[in-house]
């Protein structure tokens, strides 16, 4: 912590501005008022302090604040919030999005996962919901942040939003979170027709149970191997070799390419060679021909 | 006084590895954000990455990103940049420099990396 | 990115003259701008931060003004050891651009 020293008279700081770039540590520390700070914040950001200057100027904000700092500080943190934890900022509560719309540019491009994720965490929480303007926002301003929310905040995203989602936006979605959104998903585009419904639902099929994908197999879909890697895996076992040729359709021939990668190796081990050589793709692995598949999870559920 | 010590460069192949460190004394390395600059032959001078005191926070310039990473061990008081799949234009002259946001206050003396078939 | 250009790229000049260098950025910077000296071979060396501050150690013959778009380095009265290559580069935003450089020769 940076030392208690007394201001000298000359150094009295009346006004944030310029002057202060020459200021050592130990003279800021005296002579910067924090409320004097809190409410100079939108001067902060264009006054060219070091690493070091701006440490300061945190910790003088954190005596001032240690439940948290309120939004009007927030909204002007500027690169101040290059310094904040995810600590830090699972202290405030902000519900404007001029608010999120200003710290995501500043966080734009530097890889601080952990920091964004909290602040959007911090912004649904303050809404009480992820609604149709924050996922706007998160869409225009930081692509794929969607994804940095946990199922539980996913799951109060209405299905009403799920429409202005890109595929893009869920790129670095995981299971979990895509178990969360399918459902919606499902929901919000109920009403559209065969071809059309496949388009916007297909970057969700990550949460698709198997009913599902047997559904969309019927439906002349040729859904793309990226696609299909990226279904669960026990949602693909399930799947007959016919149902996976119809779910892909033309691109059934990618299988032989992803022949060693899950969910594709999985889903070989436990079809029938015989099954598997009706595709002609040379793929290998399958249960051989005469032996009995015992499902002994058949008969655990039932003893 | 500071000091900043690169080492690491070399003769490299099109799609080769290369790691480089910068060891740093004279100062207190964990107070401080730190940076890698490259000066290709003859040419100017380009700003490729940093990282934060804690190493928390990264940002990586588009024409290395995905292919170099930056890291910090502070208990060894040393900067590293991992160069992968390495391109005749990475060739250049690579300087570790102590980051004030205001400038880049310190500079090592550069090491030579050379990406050719 | 913010673009930085210097101007000239290069000047001749003599042991004792007054030598300007400019420096334009692409947008506003405010005062977020370093200049640096390098000499063949060298590291560069940091002369001035935040538009107009002289390093430590730096000789006062060197000293820098503007702000917004438009900087100036100057040097009053050119030294034997100042012949070299000059940068400005900016701190205003990510990611940091450096001019192209001027070199400054004897005449």
């Known amino acids: 912590d940076v030392e208690r020293t007394t201001c000298p008279p000359e150094k009295e700081v009346h006004e944030i501005d310029e002057n202060l770039i020459f200021y050592k540590k130990r003279e800021l520390e005296a002579c910067v008022d924090a409320a004097l700070l809190a409410a100079q914040m939108d001067r902060v950001d264009a006054i060219p302090f070091t690493y070091e200057q701006l440490d300061v100027l945190k910790h003088k904000l954190d005596e001032l604040y240690p439940q948290g700092y309120p939004e009007s500080v927030i909204r002007h943190l500027g690169h101040l919030f290059l310094k904040m934890s995810p600590e830090d900022i699972r202290k405030w509560n902000v519900t404007s999005l001029e608010t999120l719309k200003a710290l995501l540019k500043v966080s734009k491009g530097h890889e601080m996962s952990a920091q964004v994720a909290t602040l959007i965490d911090r912004v649904v929480v303050g809404r009480g919901q992820l609604d149709k303007d924050t996922a706007d926002t998160l869409t225009a301003f930081c692509p794929g942040c969607l994804c940095s929310l946990s199922p539980e905040r996913l799951s109060s995203v209405p299905p009403s939003v799920i429409g202005a989602v890109r595929p893009q936006d869920l790129d670095t979605c995981g299971p979990r979170q895509l178990d969360v959104l399918y459902p919606k998903a499902r929901l919000a585009f109920q009403n559209m027709s065969g071809s059309e419904y496949f388009v916007k639902i297909r970057p969700f099929l990550g949460g698709a149970p198997t009913e599902d994908l047997k559904a969309l197999s019927q439906q002349n879909v040729s859904m793309d191997l990226a696609t299909f890697m990226k279904l669960r895996r026990e949602a693909v076992l399930p799947l007959t070799v016919a149902e996976v040729q119809k779910l892909l359709g033309p691109h059934v021939e990618g299988l032989k390419v992803e022949e060693q990668h899950s969910p594709v190796r999985d889903w070989i081990l436990k079809q029938r060679q015989d099954d598997l050589d009706t595709l002609g793709l040379g793929l290998q692995g399958g249960i051989p021909n005469g032996y009995l598949i015992l499902d002994l999870s058949v008969r655990e559920a039932l003893s | 006084q500071v000091q900043l010590v690169e080492s690491g460069g070399g003769l490299v192949k099109p799609g080769g590895s290369l790691r480089l460190s910068c060891a740093a004394s004279?100062?207190?390395?964990?107070?401080?954000?730190m940076s890698w600059i490259r000066q290709a032959p003859g040419k100017g001078l380009e700003w490729i990455s940093y990282?934060?005191?804690?190493?928390?926070?990264?940002y990586y310039v588009d024409s290395v990103k995905g292919r170099f990473t930056i890291s910090r061990d502070n208990a060894k008081n040393s900067l590293y940049l991992q160069m992968n799949s390495l391109r005749a234009e990475d060739t250049a002259v690579y300087y570790c420099?102590?980051?004030?946001?205001?400038?880049?206050?310190?500079w090592g003396q550069g090491t030579l990396v050379t990406v050719s078939s | 990115d913010i673009q930085m250009t210097q101007s000239p790229s290069s000047v001749s000049a003599s042991v004792g003259d007054r030598v300007t260098i400019t420096c334009r950025a692409s947008?506003?910077?405010?005062?977020?701008l370093a200049w640096y000296q390098q000499k063949p071979g060298k590291a560069p060396n940091l002369l001035i931060y935040?538009?107009?501050s002289l390093q430590s150690g730096v000789p006062s013959r060197f000293s820098g003004s503007g702000s917004g778009t438009d900087f100036t380095l100057t040097i009053s009265s050119l030294q034997p050891e100042d012949f070299a290559t000059y940068y400005c580069?900016?701190?205003?935003?990510?990611?940091?651009?450096f001019g192209q450089g001027t070199k400054v020769d004897i005449k």
């Open positions: 935040a538009a107009s």
């Open positions: 947008q506003s910077i405010g005062s977020w």
């Open positions: 420099a102590r980051d004030v946001r205001t400038a880049f206050d310190y």
């Open positions: 580069q900016q701190a205003n935003s990510f990611p940091r651009t």
């Open positions: 004279g100062f207190t390395f964990s107070d401080h954000y």
């Open positions: 990282i934060s005191n804690s190493g928390s926070i990264i």
